[in-house]
C-alpha cells in the first residue's frame, strides 16, 4: 500500500540536491583558500540535519545552527552588497568587482543559492515531488527558514557603508515584505553601519527618472533613519554601461564630458 | 549630504590660491571618475574638472592651468587645488562623481569661496 504523501503547493526539492550540495561545497572550499579547512561531508550532514525527519512547516533557525557553525565565514564587513529583486545583476557586478560580496558569494549562500528543498516527518526521505510554499502553505519551511537565517546573519556582520542594489523596473523598489525589507534592513547594526547607500536600477534605456524620490524609496528612507543610520541613494541609469564602467573605469565613455 | 562633504572654501584677494577638498564615503567614490563643479550667484552649476580612478584629469577651458584635480583612493577624497585666483571665481564649489550612467542626484553643502579684486 502506498504511503500518503502530503502534497505541498511549491515544487519539490531540485533533483540530485545532495549530490548539487557536496559539489558546490567541494568547488567553493577549492577556490577560496579561507574555507580550504571545511569538511564538506560535515557540511552535508549538518545540512541535512536540518530538514531531514522533519515536518518542512516547522523549521527553526535553530535547525540550521550546526550549519551555520561549520559555514561560519569572515567576508570584509565593509565590502557588502545586499540586493533585492535584481539577483543577477548583483551577482554580476561582484564578478567583475571581485572585492566585494553579496550572500550568494559566501559559502552557504552559494551552497543553497537556487535550490529547493524539504523533508517529510519522521522518515529520512526527500521530497521531490513538492515542498510547502511560503504563501500558500507554510512560512516555517527550510527554504525560508534557510534564507531567513543566513540573511540575518549576514547584515549583522555588515559595517561602514553598506550597499543595496534595488530593482527599478518593480512597482515597489522597496518591498517591505523582500528578505531585505523584511530581515535585512531591520538586522544592520547601528553602532557598526554608518550609512544605507542604495542603488536604484533602471530597466529603460530612456529613463532618465530620479528613481530615488520614488515613495518606496522614501519609506526606506525613513525606516533607517529612525534606527540611527544615514541614507543615500544613487540611480544607475544604464546597468549594462555601469557595469563596463565597473570593468573599464578608464573608458573615456566612464566620464562624463566638460 | 553625508556621503560628500567640502570644505577648504573662504573669502581670498585676487590672485591668491584655496585648497578645496572633498570626503566621499561608498563604493562608487572607488570606481567612478569626480568631479568639481561650482555654482555662481544666479547662474546654472557647471562641471570645472574631473578625474578617472587611474589619476587622468580634464578642466574647463576657464580653469586650465590655475586649477589642479588630485585624488586619495585610500583617503576616499579628491582634493582641487585653485591658484591665481579671479573674482569670477566667486561661487559655492561641490564635488560629486562625473560618471555618466550614475545620476549625481545627492550634493552635498558645498564649500563657498569668495575671491574679492
Known amino acids: 500500500v502506498p504511503r500518503w504523501r502530503q502534497q505541498w503547493s511549491g515544487p519539490g526539492t531540485t533533483k540530485r540536491f545532495p549530490e548539487t550540495v557536496l559539489a558546490r561545497c567541494v568547488k567553493y572550499t577549492e577556490i577560496h583558500p579561507e574555507m580550504r579547512h571545511v569538511d564538506c561531508q560535515s557540511v552535508w550532514d549538518a545540512f541535512k540535519g536540518a530538514f531531514i525527519s522533519k515536518h518542512p512547516c516547522n523549521i527553526t533557525e535553530e535547525d540550521y545552527q550546526p550549519l551555520m557553525k561549520l559555514g561560519t565565514q569572515t567576508v570584509p564587513c565593509n565590502k557588502i552588497l545586499l540586493w533585492s529583486r535584481i539577483k543577477d545583476l548583483a551577482h554580476q557586478f561582484t564578478q567583475v568587482q571581485r572585492d566585494m560580496f553579496t550572500l550568494e558569494d559566501t559559502l552557504l549562500g552559494y551552497l543553497a543559492d537556487d535550490l529547493t528543498w524539504c523533508g517529510e516527518f519522521n522518515t529520512s526521505k526527500i521530497n521531490y515531488q513538492s515542498c510547502p510554499d511560503w504563501r500558500k502553505d507554510c512560512s516555517n519551511n527550510p527554504v525560508s527558514v534557510f534564507w531567513k537565517t543566513v540573511s540575518r546573519r549576514f547584515a549583522e556582520a555588515a559595517c561602514d557603508v553598506v550597499h543595496v542594489m534595488l530593482n527599478g523596473s518593480r512597482s515597489k523598489i522597496f518591498d517591505k515584505n523582500s528578505t531585505f525589507g523584511s530581515v535585512e534592513v531591520h538586522n544592520l547594526q547601528p553602532e557598526k553601519v554608518q550609512t544605507l547607500e542604495a542603488w536604484v536600477i533602471h530597466g529603460g534605456r530612456e529613463d532618465s527618472r530620479d528613481l530615488c524620490q520614488d515613495p518606496t524609496i522614501k519609506e526606506l528612507e525613513s525606516i533607517i533613519s529612525k534606527r540611527n543610520i544615514q541614507f543615500s541613494c544613487k540611480n544607475i541609469y544604464r546597468p549594462d554601461k555601469f557595469l563596463q564602467c565597473v570593468k573599464n573605469p578608464e573608458d573615456s565613455s566612464c566620464t562624463s564630458e566638460i | 549630504d553625508v556621503q560628500l562633504q567640502e570644505s577648504g572654501g573662504g573669502s581670498v584677494q585676487a590672485g591668491g590660491s584655496l585648497t578645496l577638498s572633498c570626503t566621499a564615503s561608498g563604493w562608487l567614490f572607488r570606481l567612478a571618475s569626480m568631479g568639481w563643479y561650482r555654482q555662481a550667484p544666479g547662474k546654472e552649476r557647471e562641471m570645472i574638472a574631473v578625474i578617472t580612478t587611474g589619476g587622468r584629469t580634464n578642466y574647463k577651458d576657464s580653469v586650465q592651468g590655475r586649477f589642479i584635480i588630485t585624488r586619495d583612493n585610500t583617503k576616499s577624497t579628491v582634493t582641487l587645488q585653485m591658484n591665481r585666483l579671479k573674482p569670477e571665481d566667486t561661487a559655492v564649489y561641490y564635488c560629486?562623481?562625473?560618471?555618466?550612467?550614475?545620476?549625481?542626484?545627492?550634493w552635498g553643502q558645498g564649500t563657498r569661496v569668495t575671491v574679492s579684486s
Open positions: 560629486n562623481t562625473s560618471m555618466p550612467v550614475v545620476g549625481a542626484d545627492e
